[in-house]
Interface confidence: low
């Protein structure tokens, strides 16, 4: 039986956002598998003409932190930190609205790209959201 655990990020695709910080993984094999999948997703994004600069500036780090969430150092058991719901919603509904609509209607993109469901994230004022991962989207401040 394998529990989730925390390990240093060893990948390349998200290194500029995560560095070698500790991320939460759900099995020994998971980090390598996710690295392969997110690399393929980023390759696809790079060739897309549908991604605006204002969206990609925050969508790329957001996807990295969703794929490789920081470990919650305040928890006594290995636990991932969530993305912040307010930023997630601004990304989906404002900065990347067109891109999300396109992505969700395109099966090929959905196969490669795992988009966060903002409704699954803790409410901003809840205790669970106190330690959420903030990307730094200006409109959320």
């Amino acid at each position: 039986e394998e529990d989730g655990f925390c390990q240093p990020y060893r990948g390349i695709a998200c290194a500029r956002f995560i560095g070698n910080r500790t991320v939460y993984m759900e099995s020994l094999h998971m980090q390598g598998e996710i690295e392969n999948q997110i690399t393929a997703a980023f390759t696809m994004i790079g060739t897309s003409s549908h991604l605006s600069d204002k969206c990609s500036q925050f969508a790329i780090p957001s996807l990295c932190h969703y794929a490789f969430p920081y470990c919650d150092e305040t928890s006594s058991v290995p636990k991932p930190r969530d993305l912040c719901r307010d930023e997630c919603e601004i990304l989906e509904n404002v900065l990347c609205q067109t891109e999300y609509i396109f992505a969700r209607s395109n099966p090929m993109i959905l196969m490669r790209l795992k988009l966060p469901n903002c409704e699954d994230l803790p409410q901003p004022e809840s205790p669970e959201a106190a330690n959420c991962i903030r990307i730094g989207i200006p409109m959320a401040d």
Partner: nanobody, 111 residues
Framework: EVQLVESGGGLVQPGGSLRLSCAAS????????VGWYRQAPGKQRELVAR???????YYADSVKGRFTISIDNSKNTLYLQMNSLRAEDTAVYYC?????WGQGTLVTVSS
């Protein structure tokens, strides 16, 4: 406490398909490592497939390209679609969420 209940097992011919389901009594939070394990007679329990909160997947080499794991959060249900089944896939299949286990469902592949 969350309870896991598997279904969908049975007898199938080699090359056939089955879909296993694992219904959870509550929402399975992203803190769980959700997946399928199997145990063949006289063998150790082994990881078959796993899915993380973002839909990132892991498959054992022996099932890659044949099995597909998926999760429906709205139904609190985990699935394992098994195609091109082989005799060596015969086992009891268990749903797993961190330290929680279902009771298992028997899959028998035989002609």
């Amino acid at each position: 406490e969350v309870q896991l209940v598997e279904s969908g097992g049975g007898l199938v011919q080699p090359g056939g398909s089955l879909r296993l389901s694992c219904a959870a009594s509550h929402y399975i939070s992203r803190f769980y490592a959700v997946g399928w394990y199997r145990q063949a007679p006289g063998k150790q329990r082994e990881l078959v497939a796993r899915i993380s909160s973002g839909g990132w997947t892991y498959y054992a080499d022996s099932v890659k390209g044949r099995f597909t794991i998926s999760i429906d959060n709205s139904k609190n249900t985990l699935y394992l679609q098994m195609n091109s089944l082989r005799a060596e896939d015969t086992a009891v299949y268990y749903c797993n969420a961190r330290n929680l286990w279902g009771q298992g469902t028997l899959v028998t592949v035989s002609s």
